[in-house]
């Protein structure tokens, strides 16, 4: 891999150390918080991201409507464990000792345990469905026309088969975006829909982990898109196993 | 059909400067990254910068940074090049090209360039 | 910026395939043919696998690593020009240009 070429850096990822120390002096880039090595040629895993985020210093609707089984990341950030791979580990614990299960997006998706707490596969998520709200616009945008810039920005920016990005619904000022990928329809090379979900969560946040041009340049026909509120909904390829204390 | 034409070439003076503007048409404009390259007689194509859609970025080769401004009129479909205090090294055939991913986080590339103008010729002399 | 590196020519007999490779960055490649000096250069790949409606389907483009390949399947005499590559992660590059010769 070469990062950018005037100045050894990775293109895809901010949170990185870059050096030329490759084979054959190539630039080569490493995880801050992990030092796992990374592709920046391509998104890297949320778990190796957010770990690194940890390590860093501190500073009769078109609309979906999430089934029960959906989840919202509540718990907020965490320092997690990632396999060789950089996907998460099926069990996360803290320095406490305790110990709770998460999808493959990095979500905890039973009540908290302790070191007892058995979790037996990395249960993926493989529907993901993103709840925008946009700023207020002239008129409402139009549909086909919101619905091509979302999909272009997805494959071009997160590098995201088509085939994946499902649905773009609207109904003014809400957008969904709804990602659909099962674990038989992700191909090797395929970007993660969890990892394009983060980094479009983090572009419309204003925290780009891209280097370069910076920050989304949303336009529908001219007109700027921007996002004033993202909420995201997680469901499992396994419905979650929470006790009914949590429910209720 | 994607068409580019630029124009403003000519007889340039050294220290003076030129505005090439390239017009669009057969496309949505207002859609993609626009770049201009350059060819000096007998050599290579050199990148020379590139902006936005929207016109809020621009980016510029080393050799024309601080003297050359890119800007675009989207309701007019053009792109202009303002180059000033030119040198002989200015001297070439000057291309508006289009560039095919505005989204993609190393959009300057010029790997991105799917369609080309005709060319306007440049000569920086005395 | 670091150079991109093509081989200053090849050559073929019609019908044979021709590879063009181009290294130095990790970017996306594209690939522009110019047939004569001053004339326009025409893209025949871009985005490494992309080709334009316009061109055949001899033309096709690939990417291993920091390496970008333009293959022509069945060669022409009408093929005959220089190949430029480009590419960059920060900014535009090209490279200096495969001269493309049909025996």
């Known amino acids: 891999h070469t990062a950018a070429q005037d100045n050894c850096t990775c293109p895809t990822n901010k949170m990185t150390v870059c050096s030329p120390d490759g084979p054959g002096g190539r630039c080569q880039c490493r995880a801050l918080g992990s030092g796992v090595a990374v592709d920046c040629s391509t998104l890297t895993s949320k778990c190796l991201l957010l770990k690194a985020r940890m390590s860093a210093p501190k500073n009769a609707r078109t609309l979906v409507r999430p089934n029960e089984h959906a989840l919202v990341d509540n718990d907020g950030l965490y320092d997690p464990d990632c396999d060789p791979e950089g996907r998460f580990k099926a069990r996360q614990c803290n320095q406490t000792s305790v110990c709770w299960c998460v999808n493959s997006v990095g979500v905890r998706r039973t009540d908290k345990g302790d070191l007892s707490l058995r979790c037996d596969e990395l249960v993926r998520t493989h529907h993901i469905l993103i709840d925008l709200r946009h700023r207020p616009t002239a008129g409402a945008f139009n549909h086909s026309d919101l619905d091509a810039e979302l999909r272009r920005l997805f494959r071009e920016r997160y590098r995201l088969h088509p085939k994946f990005v499902a649905a773009v619904h609207y109904e003014q000022p809400t957008i969904q975006i709804e990602l659909r990928q099962n674990t038989s329809q992700k191909a090797a090379g395929d970007v993660d829909i969890g990892d394009a979900a983060y980094y479009f969560e983090r572009d419309v946040k204003g925290e780009s982990l891209f280097q370069g041009r910076g920050g989304l340049d949303l336009r529908v026909r001219g007109e700027p898109l921007q996002v004033e509120r993202t909420l995201i909904y997680y469901l499992d390829e396994i419905p979650p196993k929470f006790s009914m204390k949590r429910l209720t | 059909a994607v068409t580019l034409d630029e124009s403003g070439g000519g007889l340039q003076t050294p220290g003076g400067a030129l505005s090439l503007v390239c017009k669009a048409s057969?496309?949505?404009?207002?859609?993609?990254?626009m770049f201009w390259v350059r060819q000096a007689p007998g050599k290579g194509l050199e990148w020379v910068g590139v902006?936005?859609?929207?016109?809020?970025?621009?980016n510029y080769a080393p050799a024309v940074k601080g003297r050359a401004t890119i800007s675009r009129d989207n309701g007019q479909s053009t792109m202009r090049l303002q180059l000033n205090n030119l040198r002989a090294e200015d001297t070439g055939t000057y291309y508006c090209a289009r560039g095919a991913c505005t989204h993609c986080w190393d959009a300057d590339s010029a790997g991105y360039i799917d369609a080309w103008g005709h060319g306007t010729e440049v000569i920086v002399s005395s | 910026a670091l150079a991109l590196t093509q081989p200053s020519s090849v050559s073929a007999n019609p019908g044979e395939t021709v590879k063009i490779t181009c290294s130095g960055s990790?970017?996306?490649y594209g690939w522009f043919q110019q047939k004569s000096p001053g004339s326009a250069p025409v893209t025949v790949i871009y985005w490494n696998d992309k080709r334009p409606s316009d061109i055949p389907s001899r033309f096709s483009g690939s990417t291993s690593g920091s390496t970008g390949t333009l293959t022509i399947t069945g060669v022409q005499a009408d093929d005959e020009a220089v190949y430029f590559c480009g590419n960059a992660d920060s900014s535009g590059t090209f490279g200096a240009g495969t001269t493309l010769t049909v025996l």
């Open positions: 902006i936005n859609r929207s016109g809020s970025y621009t």
């Open positions: 057969g496309f949505d404009f207002i859609d993609y990254d």
């Open positions: 990790s970017g996306s």
